[in-house]
């Protein structure tokens, strides 16, 4: 799996999970979130060469097509596969609100 | 939706469905498929600017992050959303075989 266990241990130019810490206030302008101040969002990036973690039959076909037609611009792309939620705390006036935001943290990647 | 109805009608630099015809023999080296000779596989390509068809909460966050931090390299990517199968006919000796290959045709795209 193209997850932290693999990608953060290996120097990998191909599609892999990349570390990205997002500070809510500085990076997104969301000053009102009380906790956490930021989180490890991560992101996916890297090349998708022939059969590198291909997701669907189409991405496998596209990968093969690119190998045979290297001048082609149609190639698979490195995107998130597994995502996890993030729980935040903020205040509505003096009232605390805890909310779980779905699909906020990327845990693994794929070529799609 | 970033599908043929929208994308093939508009000249669009942003993430959109692009036409791609694949000839099994010439483009993939698959000489054994009897019918069809090829098919409209299509593919997804184009930029994923702020809020252009963002797929998940993470891709929306990444989109916002990129807008505020334009020097960042962490941006969403244009990939397939809806896929359809393709039915092929081939022969095992003289015995015809009809098979449905899943996820072979891209029908729409998204930024993920």
């Amino acid at each position: 799996a193209l997850d932290a266990a693999y990608c953060f241990r290996n120097v990998q130019d191909n599609c892999c999970l990349r570390p990205l810490y997002i500070d809510f206030k500085r990076d997104l302008g969301w000053k009102w979130i009380h906790e956490p101040k930021g989180y490890n969002a991560n992101f996916c990036a890297g090349a998708c060469p022939y059969l590198w973690s291909s997701d669907t039959q189409h991405s496998r076909v596209l990968s093969l097509y690119n190998t045979i037609n290297p001048e082609a611009s149609a190639s698979p792309c490195c995107v998130s596969q597994d995502l996890e939620p993030l729980t935040i705390l903020y205040y509505i006036g003096k009232t605390p609100k805890i909310e779980q935001l779905s699909n906020m943290i990327v845990k693994s990647c794929k070529c799609s | 939706a970033l599908d043929a109805a929208y994308c093939f009608r508009n000249v669009q630099d942003n993430c959109c469905l692009r036409p791609l015809y694949i000839d099994f023999k010439r483009d993939l080296g698959w000489k054994w498929i009897h019918e069809p000779k090829g098919y409209n596989a299509n593919f997804c390509a184009g930029a994923c600017p702020y809020l252009w068809s963002s797929d998940t909460q993470h891709s929306r966050v990444l989109s916002l992050y990129n807008t505020i931090n334009p020097e960042a390299s962490a941006s969403p990517c244009c990939v397939s959303q809806d896929l359809e199968p393709l039915t092929i006919l081939y022969y095992i000796g003289k015995t015809p075989k009809i098979e449905q290959l899943s996820n072979m045709i891209v029908k729409s795209c998204k930024c993920s």
């Epitope: 302008g29 969301w30 006036g93 003096k94 009232t95 | 929306r60």
Partner: antibody
């Protein structure tokens, strides 16, 4: 230039619903809370509720008895306010107003031009 | 809910004079070193516009003839050297507690 442009005036029958839109431009829609405020003829301002467009989190004023629904479309940077079970007391000008940005519940620094909703049988 | 009471309900002021509007909250709107009180002006036929943020901070683009003061429950908006263009309804607003609430206005 920050702009909030609301949909036009509406005339509705008692018991019906109305949906008012607020199309924004000139700022990053996902960065700010969007509030809705109403003003009955010759009266003051009543806060109805707010939405955070990035993921659709909402807070409502209980005064509106669950009749109000706030939504947002990030792809078009547009906020919506739907008010159901309309009655004569709902005749008012409805405003969308952007939150200042420091707190979830905050002052409002930019306002739409207002949408007059009339309820008449 | 916090109730905001403005006085006077209406006010007539001659040009170049100073006008004062009071706003009293039913409970303190101070938290974390801030007073969560704001002032707006709604000119005839227009939408409200923010004048003062957090009790005393002049909003960008607003004339420095407007000033705000106060803390806890008692707040004041002052308009010096009043002009005809200042005509309208002035509202105070608190956001210290949910629901956010406005005063009834001073004309």
């Amino acid at each position: 230039e920050v702009q909030l442009v609301q949909s036009g005036a509406e005339v509705k029958k008692p018991g019906a619903s109305v949906k008012v839109s607020c199309k924004t431009s000139g700022y990053i829609f996902m960065k700010y809370w969007m509030n809705w405020v109403r003003q009955a003829p010759g009266a003051g301002l009543d806060w109805m509720g707010q939405i955070f467009p990035a993921w659709g989190s909402t807070n409502y004023n209980e005064m509106f008895e669950g009749r109000v629904t706030l939504t947002a479309d990030t792809s078009t940077s547009t906020a919506y306010m739907e008010l159901s079970s309309l009655r004569a007391g709902d005749i008012a000008v409805y405003y969308c107003a952007r939150g200042y940005g420091n707190y979830a519940l905050d002052a409002m620094d930019y306002w739409g031009q207002g949408t007059l909703v009339t309820v008449s049988s | 809910d916090i109730v905001m009471t403005q006085t006077p309900p209406s006010l007539s002021v001659s040009p170049r004079e100073t006008a004062s509007i009071s706003c009293r909250a039913s409970e303190s709107v101070d938290s974390y070193g801030n007073s969560f009180m704001h002032w707006y002006l709604q000119k005839p036929g227009q939408s409200p516009q923010l004048l003062i943020y957090l009790a005393s901070n002049l909003e960008s683009g607003v004339s420095d003839r407007f000033s705000g003061s106060g803390s806890g429950t008692d707040f004041t908006l002052r308009i010096s050297r009043v002009e005809a263009n200042d005509t309208g309804v002035y509202y105070c607003q608190q956001n210290d507690e949910d629901p956010l609430s406005f005063g009834q206005g001073t004309k």
